[in-house]
Structures are given as C-alpha cells and as structure tokens.
Interface confidence: low
C-alpha cells in the first residue's frame, strides 16, 4: 500500500540535522609503520570564500612509537579561516599563505606549498615521506585527523572515489543534511515520527552511529517515535533529552547506560517502507526525515512537539552573502598580543579585505589611542598603564573599538592580558569527592581526587587540564594519568570542573610489585586559554605535589613496577 | 653553504646588559626557525630562546631562567637574529650558540664567549 | 621538564672496539637526537631523530632507543672519534640536553 506523505524540505528553525562522517567524494589511506614522518594531505572545496575550518588533529599512542612527526599538506581552493589544534604534535604544515589564514598563529613548522594541480601535490608530498592518508573534501566546517591510526591494507595511498577513511579521518559537512516532513494522511492524534536512514558505506565493518536527538518541548507535551535505519553492521548509540518510542535496525544502546544492548527489528531499506514504518506506529507527522552517508555522530534538533508541520519552499540562506562585511568574523581576527607590559592589537588588512570590510578606525576604549597604519596590517599598542587599561589582579582588560563603513555603530570587543606575575597555579589532593579536605597522602587502591586552581580567579580565561602524570621513581616509573587533555586509562576519570570552573580528576593507583614506593610526584601541565577570540594569549605551566603512599595493596589496575 | 657568525660577547658586570648578534647565510633565512643556545662547564648545553619564522609569526620562546630578561628578535632582511640580555647573573656566564632548528639543530655558529662578572 | 642522563660519563676505548653510550630520560620521549663536540669547536649534529645519520656522519655510527632508553653506538672505535656526544630532546617542553660523555681512547 502506497503511504501518502509528500516530503518537503522542512525550515531550518523547524529541524536540523548535522553529522560527522568519516566518508569522502575520493580518499586513501594506507599504512606506513616505520616511517619518521606521516604524511596526511587534505583537498577542501570550499563553494565561496572565506570559509572557517576547524582542523583538530590527535594523537594516539601506539606501541610506544608516537609521537612520529606529521607533515600535513592542505590544498584549498578559496580563502580559509583556520583554527587549527594539534596539541603536542610535531607538526610540520604545508599551505598556500595567500588562501589559508590562522584565526592564531600555528606555532608549528610550516612551508610554502607550490601552486600544483593535485596529483603533482601528492607527487610533492610523496616525496617528503609515504603518505599515509590522503582525502578530496567538499566544504567541510570542521575535520578530526587522527594520527598513528592508519589501519589500512594499502602500503601505497592513491586516491580513490568514495572511500571510507575509518578511524583516521571524520569530517562535519558545513551545510545540514537535508530535513524533510510531512503529514501522514488519515492518521489522527499529535505523535510525530524522526526517521533516520544511514545508508551503507564503503566498508563494511562494525560502526556504532551515536544519534543525539534535542527535541525543544517540555517532556509532556511529546510524543514521538524515533525511527533509526542502517545497514546490518551499524548499531546506535541514542542520545536523546526526551523518553520516547525507539524503533531502530541492528542493535542500540542509551547513553546512560552504554553496555545495555536492546535488539532492534528488521526495518524497510526504502523511504516509502519507512513511512510506512512511523504509520504503522500511528505517527501523524513525520516531522523529520533524513538520509545520510555512513556517519558516526548525527545530531538533530528540532522543535516540532506534535505541533502543525511546516514546510519551507526553498533553503534558507545560512551565510552572509558573499560581498557584505560580517562584523563578528572581522572582530574575531583581531590577534591580542601580551608583552614586556603593553597589550598589542594587530589586525592583517589582507584578511580584512577578504571579508569586503572598510576599516574607518580602530582604538581602544580610549578613542585617543589609534591604531598606527603598518602597510599590511593595523597595530594598535599600549603600555598597561595608559588608554584606558582595566588593571585587575590577575588580568588587564581594555576594548576594542572598531568602526567599519557599513555600519553606523562602531564594533566592540574585550581584549584581555593575563598578569602571569600575580597568578598562582595549585594543586588539591583530596580522599574524597566533596574535595573539602586535602591531603598529601595517596592509599593503593583507594581512589584520589585531583582538583586545580589558579588564584586570584580568571574569568574571561579557561583553566583546562592538558596532562598529568605520576612520577613514582626508579621503582615506579611514571603513571600517565591525563595526556591531550583525555583520562589515561580506565582507572582515570575526568571529573565536572568544581563550580568555580576549576579541573578535576580522580585516579585510583595499584602496584603490582614490590617495593611500592613511598613517595611520588604528581606533575601536571595546565593551560589558561581565553574563552573567546584569538588563542595568541594562551599561558601553560607545569604544577607540581610532592605525594606521600601508604598501605601496600596488590590487586589491580595502573602503574608498572 | 649554511653560516652562522655570532658576535657581541664580551665581559659585564652582574645587572648589565649586552646585546648579541648573529649573522646567517647560505639558505632562506626568512623560512628558518632560529635559537640560542649556551653552553658552560657548570650547566653544560642549555637551551635559551627560539624565535620562528615569518610563517608561524616570528613566535618567540624562552627557556624559564631567562624568561623576562632576554629578548630572542630577528631582522629578515638583513638575515640576522639577536638575543638582547638584561638583567644579567653571574650564571649566564658561557659560550652562546646560534644555531637553526630543522627537526633538530642542523646548524651552529662558532660561539661567541660571554663573562658576567664584577 | 624531562632530564636526560648520559651514561657513562667518560668512556674509554681502544681503536677497533665496538662502544654504546646511553641517554635516559625522565619521562619518554618520542626520538633523541645527537651531537658531537670536540674541543674548542662547537656542537656538530650527529643523529637525529633517533636514527638517522646527520650529513658527513661515517656509517660505523648508529642510534637505536625509544621510550626513556636511547643509545649510539659505534661499531669501530677511530681516533677521529674521541669527543663528547651530547643527546638532546624536544618531545616536551623545554628543549633539554644531556650532560654529556666524552669518549677518550686508549
């Protein structure tokens, strides 16, 4: 029977749906163990420039040998905004200069990369070491490289339509997957159907797709039916801030409770069978259907609630057009230096003109400190004590005032300097989770908890907890307990920073051996990082806490003797 | 052939100041990342401040003892790199290198010998 | 930071004898690299990333190592050998080097 529910595209205020995928137009990954440098080249197509990237690169330690250095060749067809994270990671970068700008500067190795067409790119970067991924992406908003995970059978990489790149590379398309809905005709009531169909990919080994479904309305008011569909090898991993009805292929699993596997049902592979399928569950709307690429995390968002369905005749423009001057892109290239008790502004006139922005001024809070024409660049500098500076204990504040031609209102923005002089960094170890009394004294097999806290606090900066280790002596060796800011192991936990935004963690520690060591180190680098704008201020240092161990205990989980 | 030609040493008093200079040629100096780095019978080699190449922003880079003190610049255009020193101790007494860090340091001038004494 | 100890700190050898100098780090690293000293000059590079041969280097050298043990070794003893070799890391924050170990012959 044939259901009768014409699909249409659905507003974007009505539903969206984002996804990573590890799945690109053309790609290749290959394996290349002994080489000392991994070669990983990106093709990006952006559709108009400028584009914004977010580029993350990780690092996985295999076997001792990470990390190698990464040479990553980026070949792009328009201007890019980067934003680049490779924390730790030898990196060495080819770009061309003119099309790709840092939203901060890399601090990493980088070389010119010549104006070649794409075969002699990868015929260049061959030459450099073997490559061991390489991939075509179209607009991408936001790629994941992970480094070290090569698991392919190839010991050559040569490009290929359509390929699956595993582990080692997923990327989030900028433009939302296509949502439509519609009414299923003579159905009555308000439950409304999210179908998803994840089509098969092009490689056929185990996935877990994690859904996050945001449905904007209080619990009462909904219900719904989740309808999930993918090829035999997927199973799902649900995400969802609402209690409602879930119909999937394959196995699932909720968040909360990962290791619970429910058994799904065999679904139809057709969009009319899947309608069917939400008809059957007495749906009367569907008020999203997507079909997406072999994806590992889809989210969607929609705000329908059983109401009245709307559809939208045609995509709604999401990006400024192209020759209009977007004020928050161009406040967010304003780079903030700190340096010898002067805050510093620069801002590149290059990138300024990629945006189609007219610059009439730029001062700080104070309008008679002006920025200084530089030929290439606008530099804007004052000693701490002058135009206007907020000094606080721990900060220097001051604004940025930039007037533009298109806009009648001059634009703002906060800059900030940290006064490293007056801030201190601490370590807290506590034998509880309430970490209200602490100690200095660790007990195997009892777990610790690890808070860290800079004082006087910082507001407009993060304190992020980029790697602790336990160095336990000869005996010992070093327990890694935090590395790349990600928990170590399972007996590791990363814990909700406390309410005044400090990191915490908590680790339990095992001795296989004796002796067990009396004492220990615990070493952890932390980083200050502004919460908005440029990363050109972010501050790192190394804390330390000299540690006590009682009570042998020899069961267990961490440290080598 | 790579070169790189420090000169500026010399004998201060402690809390004195004195600026070194390093000459390069022989490859783009303007692509290279640049370091000093000291050497004494005490302390042995020591790292002292890196400042990188117009690609990666001329960012600079400081081991902790000289943190403050010393001032790591460059000047492209005339393919040199200098280390301005304040504030100096009878500890940073030693031979300082320039050296270029290409994966490792490929490269190191001859060492121009600096002595803070009273 | 991560402290490079060299071992021994002086090495004697005979011409023709095969030697192994270590480097220890505090905490592991991903590749050591060498260089060589000789009296009155300045640092020369050696091996870098762990292994690899620095240009004019004879092949009688080699570097092995990963973790927190790194060596060099050479296969035969010359008299163009005696110097100090220094190791050097930059895996971590700060940049170190080793204290050193002079290789004198006998």
């Known amino acids: 029977e044939t259901v009768h529910c014409d699909l249409q595209p659905v507003g974007p205020e009505r539903g969206e749906v984002t996804y990573t995928t590890s799945q690109v137009s053309k790609g290749c990954v290959a394996q290349a163990p002994n080489a000392i440098l991994e070669v990983h080249v990106l093709f990006l197509e952006f559709p108009t420039g400028p584009s914004q990237l977010e580029l993350t690169l990780q690092a996985s330690k295999q076997n001792g040998t990470w990390p190698r250095e990464v040479l990553l060749v980026l070949s792009v067809n328009s201007s890019v905004f980067l934003h680049l994270q490779a924390l730790g990671i030898p990196l060495h970068l080819a770009y061309n200069s003119s099309l790709v700008t840092f939203q901060e500067p890399p601090g990493v190795n980088t070389t010119e990369l010549p104006s070649f067409p794409k075969t002699q790119i990868l015929e260049w970067a061959a030459e450099r070491g073997p490559i061991t991924s390489a991939a075509e992406l179209n607009d991408p908003q936001s790629i994941l490289l992970r480094l070290g995970q090569a698991q392919g059978s190839l010991s050559f990489c040569m490009l290929e339509a359509s390929q699956d790149m595993g582990r080692t590379l997923e990327w989030r398309p900028r433009t939302p997957a296509l949502v439509r809905g519609c009414h299923l005709e003579g159905v009555a009531g308000h439950k409304e159907a999210h179908i998803l169909r994840v089509l098969p990919g092009h490689s056929a080994g185990p996935r877990t797709v994690t859904v996050k479904v945001e449905l904007s309305c209080a619990p009462g008011d909904l219900d719904a039916v989740l309808i999930l569909q993918g090829p035999p090898y997927v199973s799902w991993l649900i995400d969802a801030n609402h209690n409602m009805q879930i119909w999937t292929t394959g196995e699932y699993s909720f968040k909360i409770f990962p290791e619970k596997n429910i058994r799904g049902f065999k679904l139809p592979d057709t969009p009319q069978g899947l309608l069917g399928e939400a008809r059957m569950l007495n749906a009367s709307i569907v008020a999203s259907f997507v079909e997406l690429p072999l994806a590992s995390i889809v989210s969607l968002h929609a705000s329908s609630c059983g109401g009245r369905l709307q559809t939208s005749p045609a995509p709604i423009q999401t990006t400024p057009p192209k020759d209009t001057c977007s004020p928050e892109l161009l406040m967010s290239l304003i780079q903030t230096k700190c340096a010898d008790d002067a805050m510093t502004l620069v801002l590149k006139k290059e990138l300024v003109a990629h945006l189609k922005c007219t610059i009439t001024g730029l001062t700080f809070w104070d309008p008679s400190c002006e920025a200084e024409d530089r030929g290439d660049k606008f530099v804007l500098r004052s000693a701490y004590s002058s135009c206007g500076m907020q000094v606080s204990a721990s900060m220097i504040s001051n604004e940025a005032v930039v007037n533009i031609l298109s806009s009648s209102s001059p634009q703002r923005k906060k800059v900030h300097c940290l006064n490293m002089d007056s801030l201190s960094f601490q370590l807290g170890l506590y034998l509880s989770p309430h970490f209200l009394q602490a100690s200095n004294t660790i007990e195997p097999g009892q777990q610790s908890f690890v808070q860290v806290r800079v004082s006087p606090s910082v507001s407009e900066f993060l304190l992020q907890l980029d790697s602790c280790h336990l160095d336990l002596g000869p005996e010992g060796g070093t327990v890694e307990l935090i590395q790349g800011r990600a928990a170590k192991g399972n007996c590791v936990s990363l814990l909700s920073p406390s309410p005044e935004g400090d990191p915490r963690f908590s680790f339990l520690l095992h001795f296989y051996t004796v002796p067990i060591p009396k004492t220990g180190t615990l070493s952890c680098t932390v980083a200050l990082r502004p919460k908005t704008g440029s990363q050109d201020q972010e501050v790192h240092r190394t804390v330390f806490m000299r540690l006590n161990i009682i009570s042998p205990d020899l069961s267990g989980c961490t440290s080598k003797g | 052939e790579v070169k790189l030609e420090e000169s500026g040493g010399g004998l201060v008093q402690p809390g004195g100041s004195m600026k070194l200079s390093c000459a390069a040629s022989?490859?783009?100096?303007?692509?290279?990342?640049m370091d000093w780095v000291r050497q004494s019978p005490e302390k042995g080699l020591e790292w002292v401040a890196e400042i990188r190449s117009k690609a990666s922003n001329h960012a600079t880079y400081y081991a902790e003892s000289v943190k403050g003190r010393f001032t790591i610049s460059r000047d492209d255009s005339k393919s040199s790199v200098y280390l301005q020193m304040n504030s100096l101790r009878a500890e940073d007494t030693g031979i300082y290198y320039c050296t270029r860090w290409r994966r490792f340091f490929d490269s190191w001038g001859q060492g121009t010998t600096l002595t803070v004494s009273s | 930071q991560i402290v490079l100890s060299q071992s021994p700190a002086i090495l004697s050898a005979s011409p023709g004898e095969k030697v192994t100098m270590t480097c220890r780090a505090s905490s592991s690293v991903s590749y050591m690299h060498w260089y060589q000293q000789k009296p009155g000059s300045s640092p020369k590079p050696w091996i870098y990333a762990t292994s690899n041969l620095a240009s004019g280097v004879p092949v009688r050298f080699s570097g092995s190592g990963s973790g927190t043990s790194y060596s060099l070794t050479i296969s035969r003893v010359e008299a163009e050998d005696a110097a100090t070799y220094y190791c050097?890391?930059?895996?971590?924050?700060?940049?170190?080097f080793g204290a050193g170990t002079k290789l004198e012959l006998k």
């Open positions: 050097q890391q930059w895996s971590s924050n700060p940049l170190t």
């Open positions: 022989g490859f783009t100096f303007s692509d290279a990342w």
